[in-house]
C-alpha cells in the first residue's frame, strides 16, 4: 500500500483592501490534485492577531476566508489541505501546513498615537468620536481620521472634524446608513513636519455604544391611597420601546426612597399619606435584546409634586 | 389576564422531529420577547432562545442552533418550537415564557423520546 | 457564558425559621439577577427581580440583595407552602443562564 500524500495549497497571502482591518485570506489549489478528481478537497485555515492565545479555525471548501482583525498588532495565518476519508478508502488525509503573516509597518513611536479614543453613538443617530493628541508631540502634528464598514465602497475620510487649537481631536460623522449590526473600522493617522506618528487602529459595532437621549414627559398619577404610578415617555429617535432598559431614581422628602432598574415606561410606588415632596429622576440605556452594551442616557429633568395633597392632582410636567 | 397555552404531551421517535405551540391572550402579542426554556427531569432551567412577534427576529442560546427553529404566527397569536433529529437528551419539559416587561410562564410541554 | 452557582443545593428547615439561599455569578453582573420559585409539576414564578425588587402579589417575607457577583434570597419566617426549588437567572447577557437550583425540604 502506497501512503496517500496532498499537498498544501499554494500561494496562500493576506490581503488587506485598504478597509483599515477587514482582510482577505486567499490561496490556490495544491498541485499534484489530478489523482481526486472526484473528490472535494477541503481546506483548513487558521488564524490569529500576533499575541492571541487561541487560533480561529475554519473549514472551507472555497480559496479565500474574510475577516476583521486588529491591524495594531500583526497577524498570522496558516491553511493546509483535508482529503475527507471518503477520498481515501480510510482516515482523513492532512497535507502540511502553508504560512503566511501580514503587519503594517509602524511608523512612529507609539507615544505619538492619538491617546483616550472614545466614540458614542448619540440616539443611535449620530457618531461622535473623540481623541487627546499623542504624548510630547507638536502643535503642527495633525490626526486624520478614515472609517470603513462593509456596504461603503472603500474607506472615507471624516469630512467634519472637531478642533482645538488648531488640532484636529475628533470627528463628527455623517449619516451612517445600515452601519449598525457590523463591524466600524476606524484608523487615526497623523503627521508633522517633526517626525513619524503612529496609526492607530479601531474596530466596534455602533449598536453597542448608543447613548440614548434621557426620558420625557414625566407624569404622577394617584392610583390609590398608597400607590403612585409614574410614567415617562421614550425620547424622541429612531429608538423602539422593546431596546430601553431604565433606571428611577425616587426622593421622598429629600430622602433617597428607591433605586430602581425598570423594563417598561411606568413605576408603581407604594407612598404614605405623610409624604409632604415627591421626586423622581429616569435616565435609558439600550438593552440586551437590542445589543450587547451601552451607554446610560443623562438623567431627565427632576420632576415633583410639592406642597398640596396628591391625591387631588395629576401632575405633569 | 395574560395567559400562555402550550400544546399537549409528546412522544416520539429518536431521529423525528417535533413541533410545539404556545398561544398567547390578554396582552399585545406583538410588542413582547417570547422565550422557550428546557427543563430535564429532575434538573435545573436552560434558555433555549426567543422570537420577537413584532418583527420575526429570532435569538438562539448557541447551544441549541441547528436543534431548534421558532416561528411565529401573527393571526393566531402562537408561536411555535421546531425539535429537530430528536434523541433521548431532547426528553424533557419545555416552558414558554414571557420574560420581559411582563413575567408570565405557560404550564409546559411535556416531550418524550423513544424507541 | 456566565455561570450561577447556587448554594446550598438543599437546605431543610422548619416553618418559621429564617433561611438565606446564596447565588454567586462567574463575573460581575451588576443587578441583574432575578430569583424564581418552582414548585413539583408547576412553572416557575418570579419571586424578585434585579437582585432586590419585590414582585407585586409575593409576599413581603421574601426579599433579595446583592450586587456584582454575590446574591441572596432571603425568607423571613419560612411557611410550609414555601417547600420547593429556588432558581436565580441572569440577564446580564446572552445566553440566560440559570443556577442548578436549591431545594427547600421540610426538616
Known amino acids: 500500500d502506497t501512503e496517500i500524500k496532498v499537498n498544501p495549497p499554494q500561494d496562500f497571502e493576506i490581503v488587506d483592501p485598504g478597509y483599515l482591518g477587514y482582510l482577505y485570506l486567499q490561496w490556490q489549489p495544491p498541485l499534484s490534485l489530478d489523482h481526486f478528481k472526484e473528490c472535494t478537497v477541503e481546506y483548513e485555515l487558521k488564524y490569529r492577531n500576533i499575541g492571541s492565545e487561541t487560533w480561529k479555525t475554519i473549514i472551507t471548501k472555497n480559496l479565500h476566508y474574510k475577516d476583521g482583525f486588529d491591524l495594531n498588532k500583526g497577524i498570522e495565518a496558516k491553511i493546509h489541505t483535508l482529503l475527507p476519508w471518503q477520498c481515501t478508502n480510510g482516515s482523513e488525509v492532512q497535507s502540511s501546513w502553508a504560512e503566511t503573516t501580514y503587519w503594517i509597518s509602524p511608523q512612529g513611536i507609539p507615544e505619538t498615537k492619538v491617546q483616550d479614543m472614545d466614540c458614542v453613538y448619540y440616539n443611535w443617530q449620530y457618531l461622535l468620536c473623540s481623541w487627546k493628541p499623542g504624548i510630547g508631540v507638536l502643535l503642527d502634528t495633525n490626526y486624520n481620521l478614515f472609517y470603513w464598514y462593509e456596504g461603503l465602497d472603500h474607506a472615507l475620510q471624516c469630512v467634519d472634524y472637531i478642533k482645538a487649537d488648531g488640532q484636529n481631536i475628533g470627528c463628527r460623522f455623517p449619516y451612517l446608513e445600515a452601519s449598525d449590526y457590523k463591524d466600524f473600522y476606524i484608523c487615526v493617522n497623523g503627521s508633522s513636519e517633526n517626525k513619524p506618528i503612529r496609526s492607530s487602529y479601531f474596530t466596534f459595532q455602533l449598536q453597542n455604544i448608543v447613548k440614548p437621549l434621557p426620558p420625557v414627559y414625566l407624569t404622577f398619577t394617584r392610583e390609590s391611597s398608597c400607590e403612585i404610578k409614574l410614567k415617562w415617555s421614550i425620547p424622541l429617535g429612531p429608538i423602539p420601546a422593546r431596546c430601553f432598559d431604565y433606571e428611577i431614581e425616587i426622593r421622598e422628602d429629600d430622602t433617597t426612597l428607591v433605586t430602581a432598574t425598570v423594563e417598561n415606561e411606568t413605576y408603581t410606588l407604594k407612598t404614605t399619606n405623610e409624604t409632604r415632596q415627591l421626586c423622581f429622576v429616569v435616565r435609558s440605556k439600550v438593552n440586551i435584546y437590542c445589543s450587547d452594551d451601552g451607554i446610560w442616557s443623562e438623567w431627565s429633568d427632576k420632576q415633583c409634586w410639592e406642597g398640596e395633597d396628591l391625591s387631588k392632582k395629576t401632575l405633569l410636567r | 389576564q395574560v395567559q400562555l397555552q402550550q400544546s399537549g404531551p409528546e412522544l416520539v421517535k429518536p431521529g423525528t422531529s417535533v413541533k410545539m405551540s404556545c398561544k398567547a391572550s390578554g396582552y399585545t402579542f406583538t410588542s413582547n420577547y417570547i422565550h422557550w426554556v428546557k427543563q430535564r427531569p429532575g434538573q435545573g432551567l436552560e434558555w433555549i432562545g426567543w422570537?420577537?412577534?413584532?418583527?420575526?427576529?429570532?435569538k438562539y442560546n448557541e447551544k441549541f442552533k441547528g436543534k431548534t427553529t421558532l416561528t411565529a404566527d401573527k393571526s393566531s397569536s402562537t408561536v411555535y418550537m421546531l425539535l429537530s433529529s430528536l434523541t433521548s437528551e431532547d426528553s424533557a419539559i419545555y416552558f414558554c415564557?414571557?420574560?420581559?416587561?411582563?413575567?408570565?410562564w405557560g404550564q409546559g410541554t411535556t416531550l418524550t423520546v423513544s424507541s | 457564558d456566565i455561570v450561577l452557582t447556587q448554594s446550598p443545593a438543599t437546605l431543610s428547615v422548619t416553618p418559621g425559621d429564617s433561611v438565606s439561599l446564596s447565588c454567586r455569578a462567574s463575573q460581575s453582573i451588576s443587578n441583574n439577577l432575578h430569583w424564581y420559585q418552582q414548585k413539583s409539576h408547576e412553572s416557575p414564578r418570579l419571586l424578585i427581580k434585579?437582585?432586590?425588587q419585590s414582585i407585586s402579589g409575593i409576599p413581603s417575607r421574601f426579599s433579595g440583595s446583592g450586587s456584582g457577583t454575590d446574591f441572596t434570597l432571603s425568607i423571613n419566617s419560612v411557611e410550609t407552602e414555601d417547600f420547593g426549588m429556588y432558581f436565580c437567572q441572569q440577564s446580564n447577557s446572552w445566553p440566560l443562564t440559570f443556577g442548578a437550583g436549591t431545594k427547600l425540604e421540610l426538616k
Open positions: 415564557a414571557v420574560l420581559r416587561r411582563l413575567d408570565y
Open positions: 422570537i420577537y412577534p413584532g418583527d420575526g427576529s429570532i
Open positions: 434585579y437582585a432586590s
